[in-house]
């Protein structure tokens, strides 16, 4: 899976939630960053995401002629240099700080499941997606055939504005 | 290459029903959103029908709601639209149309020809 | 649901005129939008997506601009096989199409 360009088609911030509307916070703790999935007070501002959005190829049409090739891919980051990471060894997802270009595991390709719910895929690991899991993001292997609707893996984006610089 | 037939339309009276086909091929199926698009004629496009790519979740406007159902057998690569009480403002091109991109909903990346629908008595 | 006004209906234009389509939104649509060509007979054909990219082997002379509710399709250089219907299309909340502006030779 290659990404065609370096520079992201389009960006947005957005606040993300869970399918159960809860939402996805990020907390500053001992210099490095929580995650977490919580219900929000009423008078909470909710985090913001900047989403950026990246045109691929797929594997599959990397040798023929493109046609049926194209993917979304998004990376998300919270803050300033840091973005949601997949670690698939822990089957975990984490914030990391790092520095263009963007490891691998910052990618996740875009799935709308419905027209007002998307999922995240891993780049590095396809077939696993970011999920809720006891109140925390980790990477959740979907049985494609099985489990197409699970809720766990289902998020809403509530997109603020466009955004062109953090 | 991608490609896209339309079948099944005709002339048919009101509230009389008929269902359409579109033959997809030369790409995965089964992993894109497809709907179909009308235009009335002399008219502009009207979004008709959305469905995923796993036929689970299916979207219609208003002016359809209740009387259209999109549907799709990802094993024949066939997206299908069943019209029934059919109104004579149902009269159009009936267009089927593929995502522009695996799995999102962004997008008709690529049409059909189109086949007309006549509704009249 | 949203409502996607576009204007003018129809323009005259000569080749090499610069021509300018606006699409406004009934509400905040980010950049969602599309622009989409059609001719007599034929079935529409994808311009530019997500506001300002552009389609494979559409010509660079195509582009498009804007965000929030307000977007607008430019070409720089009128040219004779762009005299066609232009659509713009937003699928931010639903789906949704303008009405359509016909590009005539002046």
């Known amino acids: 899976m290659s990404i065609t360009g370096i520079s992201p088609i389009t960006e947005s911030l957005a606040s993300l939630s869970t399918y159960n509307d809860q939402s996805i916070t990020f907390a500053l703790e001992d210099e490095s960053y929580e995650i977490y999935v919580e219900d929000l007070k009423k008078d909470k501002k909710k985090d913001k995401v900047l989403l950026s959005y990246y045109e691929s190829q797929h594997p599959s049409s990397e040798s023929g002629d493109g046609v049926d090739g194209k993917m979304l891919m998004v990376t998300l980051s919270p803050t300033k240099d840091f973005w949601l990471q997949a670690n698939n060894k822990e089957h975990s997802v984490e914030l990391h700080k790092s520095e263009k270009p963007l490891p691998d595991q910052a990618f996740f390709v875009l799935h709308n499941r419905s027209f007002n719910s998307v999922s995240f895929e891993s780049k590095t690991d396809p077939g696993v997606f970011i999920g809720v899991k006891d109140n925390h993001l980790a990477l959740i292997k979907v049985d494609y055939s099985e489990n197409l609707g699970s809720e766990n893996i289902l998020f809403k984006l509530s997109e603020i504005h466009h955004h062109h610089h953090h | 290459e991608v490609q896209l037939v339309e079948s099944g339309g005709g002339l048919v009276q009101p509230g009389g029903s008929l269902r359409l086909s579109c033959a997809a091929s030369?790409?995965?199926?089964?992993?894109?959103?497809m709907y179909w698009v009308r235009q009335a004629p002399g008219k502009g496009l009207e979004w008709v029908a959305s469905?995923?790519?796993?036929?689970?979740?299916?979207y219609y406007p208003d002016s359809v709601k209740g009387r259209f159902t999109i549907s799709r057998d990802n094993a024949k690569n066939s997206l299908y639209l069943q019209m029934n009480s059919l109104r004579a403002e149902d009269t159009a091109v009936y267009y089927c149309?593929?995502?522009?991109?695996?799995?999102?909903?962004?997008?008709?990346?690529?049409w059909g020809q189109g086949t007309l629908v006549t509704v009249s008595s | 649901d949203i409502q996607m006004t576009q204007s003018p209906s129809s323009l005259s234009a000569s080749v090499g005129d610069r021509v300018t389509i606006t699409c406004k939104a009934s509400?905040?649509?980010?950049?969602?939008l599309d622009w989409y060509q059609q001719k007599p007979g034929k079935a529409p054909k994808l311009l530019i997506y997500?506001?300002?990219n552009l389609q494979t082997g559409v010509p660079s002379r195509f582009s498009g601009s804007g965000s929030g509710t307000d977007f607008t399709l430019t070409i720089s250089s009128l040219q004779p096989e762009d005299f066609a219907t232009y659509y713009c299309?937003?699928?931010?909340?639903?789906?949704?199409f303008g009405g359509g502006t016909k590009v005539e030779i002046k």
């Open positions: 149309a593929r995502g522009h991109y695996y799995y999102t909903s962004y997008s008709l990346g690529y």
């Open positions: 030369g790409f995965t199926f089964s992993s894109y959103w």
């Open positions: 997500f506001t300002n």
């Open positions: 299309f937003q699928y931010n909340n639903g789906w949704t």
């Open positions: 509400q905040n649509i980010n950049k969602h």
């Open positions: 469905i995923t790519p796993n036929g689970g979740n299916t």
